[in-house]
């Protein structure tokens, strides 16, 4: 008689997960010398305890601990890039701008970006069928909270000025319901952090407005005043020639707006 | 929206050389294994050759050993086909896509999201 199985509304763990986690593991840690000294088998053995064999509605950020302590990992706390709905562009921004960091040029980040991973309460196995949805099944899934937990870290981490990319094609260019608007925002160091500097990127080339006098970007001026973090707003009218002046910036055409 | 774009084909003389490009938009090409694949007129697609992630393994078709070189930068997010001493039987069109782990298993690369790109053309002719 088969099993029965918790049919879940979000898509199963990601094919070949534990491999692909191992992989990216071994090339984080040859890439990046200050973290040579990490066994990638102790981080997988980390990683699917903190999931496996639990209820994929009753993860905690403390099951995660054990891999936390694994990746712990100093990055330039002046250098952290958030960025909320404008992942890719912050992420060729960061391929180019070698100093400074998203969460996923972390390792931890790097393992999980862009995978899907849950397991079954009192079996071992790895749930390649279906994995909970945020809003239709239930928000403490194990993917949900991994990245919560470490967008915490990220942010506490965070020192001077803080820089974060938003995306001006969207109806609410801050969304207090995403990873930054719920998680970041509030776990920025007003001790350390001086100065939240958001870039709003503009879609389209026509586009001249000034997305800074957005109301959603006010609201976001307001949170951060009143935890006593100076906030400044920039807008990126040309994010193309935003990356190619990042490449060349000895370019003449870089002297003007972007 | 996430695509790979070849390039770098064109008409050459046997024995000679091409240097075919493979570059990603919307997505990190860090996170993949990527192969190359190529269709010859009248035949079914098939993988020549596989990079993974960490660019430290290779792995090369029968039919292109010891004369194309794979390799990648994750910088430029591109990855390149070093083609040399190229046959009559080189000609086709040329794809690359991302496997869907991050490792070559031998050559049978199974491709992680099916939107092939269009190609680059190679034609070997005297």
């Known amino acids: 008689v088969p099993r029965w199985r918790q049919q879940w509304s979000g898509p199963g763990t990601t094919k070949r997960f534990p491999e692909t986690v191992l992989a990216r593991c071994v090339k984080y840690t040859e890439i990046h010398p200050e973290m040579r000294h990490v066994d990638c088998q102790s981080v997988w053995d980390a990683f699917k305890g903190a999931f496996i064999s639990k209820h994929p509605c009753n993860i905690t950020e403390e099951d995660y601990q054990p891999l936390m302590k694994l990746g712990t990992q100093t990055v330039p706390c002046n250098k952290i890039l958030l960025w909320s709905r404008i992942k890719d562009l912050a992420h060729q921004f960061t391929q180019v701008q070698r100093d400074m960091f998203t969460l996923e040029d972390t390792l931890l980040g790097y393992l999980a970006d862009d995978l899907t991973w849950c397991g079954e309460f009192n079996t071992s196995k790895i749930n390649y069928q279906s994995c909970p949805d945020w809003r239709k099944d239930c928000s403490n899934n194990p993917v949900s909270v991994f990245w919560k937990t470490v967008s915490r870290r990220f942010a506490e981490a965070a020192c001077d000025v803080v820089h974060v990319m938003l995306n001006g094609s969207r109806s609410k260019i801050f969304d207090k319901n995403s990873t930054f608007g719920s998680v970041e925002v509030h776990n920025l160091q007003p001790e350390k952090v001086q100065t939240l500097e958001a870039w709003v990127i503009h879609g389209g080339r026509e586009d001249s407005r000034d997305l800074c006098q957005d109301p959603t970007i006010k609201e976001l001026e307001s949170i951060i005043s009143k935890r006593n973090i100076q906030f400044s707003c920039k807008n990126i009218y040309r994010p193309d020639k935003f990356l190619q002046c990042v490449k060349n910036p000895e370019d003449s055409s870089c002297t003007s707006e972007i | 929206q996430v695509q790979l774009v070849e390039s770098g084909g064109g008409l050459v003389q046997p024995g000679g050389s091409l240097r075919l490009s493979c570059t990603a938009s919307?997505?990190?090409?860090?996170?993949?294994?990527i192969g190359w694949f190529r269709q010859a007129p009248g035949k079914e697609r098939e993988a020549i050759s596989c990079i993974d992630i960490t660019g430290m393994h290779t792995n090369y078709g029968d039919s292109v050993m010891g004369r194309f070189t794979i390799s990648r930068d994750d910088a430029k997010r591109t990855v390149y086909l070093q083609m040399n001493s190229l046959e009559a039987e080189d000609t086709g069109i040329y794809y690359c896509a991302p496997a869907q782990y991050a490792a070559c298993s031998a050559l049978g690369v199974k491709v992680s999201f099916t939107s092939w790109g269009q190609g680059t053309q190679v034609t070997v002719s005297p």
């Open positions: 919307g997505f990190r090409l860090d996170y993949y294994a």
